[in-house]
Amino acid sequence: APVLPGEDSKDVAAPHSQPLTSSERIDKHIRYILDGISALRKETCNRSNMCESSKEALAENNLNLPKMAEKDGCFQSGFNEDTCLVKIITGLLEFEVYLEYLQNRFESSEEQARAVQMSTKVLIQFLQKKAKNLDAITTPEPTTNASLLTKLQAQNQWLQDMTTHLILRSFKEFLQSSLRALRQM
């Protein structure tokens, strides 16, 4: 942190650090969630063969997982800061229901699943602060989310395992794209 006027720096700190900028804080937070996803994917891949499965398309049809597209303005070509920020926040809000679904899907990584969910809420908050002048952010309907959750939980075991795998993979890709885009902002 900065040195106080009239104080010798060694009285304040040795050495002294700068408070994190909001961008650094967001960056660290995304890394934290990505590390959590890695741990969850490890458990998923260890307990089933979903990670090598070629039948992903079957399950993917049932899911409407957020994805980055060219029109979202998050890629290097056609980059648009405001449009991209809206897409990142909207996407994270849409992922929340899927993260809720993951909560009972892990045994040894239960804490990590909870941490990923909680940290995503924190990340949304950090980003909303960065985007406080943007009003184009739509929040998913709670009733829609509730019925989607019920539908996902009613699937057979194979589909639930596949859904878990796809959520983690898609969320990882979405966060990686977000991280790259946010570093340009």
Epitope: P2, A13, Y32, I33, D35, A115, V122, K129
Partner: antibody, heavy 115, light 107 residues
Framework: YPQLVESGGGLVQPGGSLRLSCEAS???????MSWVRQAPGKGLEWVGS????????YYNTKFIDRFTISRDNSKNTLYLQMNSLRAEDTAVYYC?????????WGQGTLVTVSS | AIYMHQEPSSLSASVGDRVTITCQAS??????LAWYQQKPGKAPKLLIY???DRYPEVPSRFSGSGSHEDYTLTISSLQPEDFATYYC?????????FGQGTKLEIK
Amino acid sequence: YPQLVESGGGLVQPGGSLRLSCEASVLFKHQDMSWVRQAPGKGLEWVGSIDPRGDHKYYNTKFIDRFTISRDNSKNTLYLQMNSLRAEDTAVYYCARDLDFMDEWGQGTLVTVSS
Amino acid sequence: AIYMHQEPSSLSASVGDRVTITCQASYWLNSELAWYQQKPGKAPKLLIYDGDDRYPEVPSRFSGSGSHEDYTLTISSLQPEDFATYYCQQYRYTPYTFGQGTKLEIK
């Protein structure tokens, strides 16, 4: 299991040394981490922090000569090496994720310095 | 180092009361201030960061406000689980420093 678990506390004689450990889940690999202590019945006191790679360390000047923070990312563990301990170092020592504010804490480990 | 003067040091209140705890810094903080709740034998829990941002899943009865050197934590309607010790912390300057704490007790 909890995300941050401190260990290594105990009874030590004045002038002695102790190394505290904080075992972290994999989520903390790329995070700044801090040590914070709390003497019995007293308030919180920041000891210092370390960046993800262990290259940069920041200390409360009060502890800079006696305490050293380090980490071993291959073991997902944060350390606090405490030397020349005094009775006033008796406290619960917490490790925490440091985003400038501390949003994740361990349960703490008690260090008692007494003869 | 920045000195954080927290008041009151202890406070007796009843369930349903509105409670205010203040923290005054010895220097301008740019809202880089957090509030924590701590219960006996437990680690502190983050309530508020950046002066007025409520950490996710913290009940809406907790709110933070303030600017420059003066900051406030308000609990709008005390619940039984809110009886604890509260600390402010500045992170504008290293070393990070905490207030002395406010022990909130049942009247």
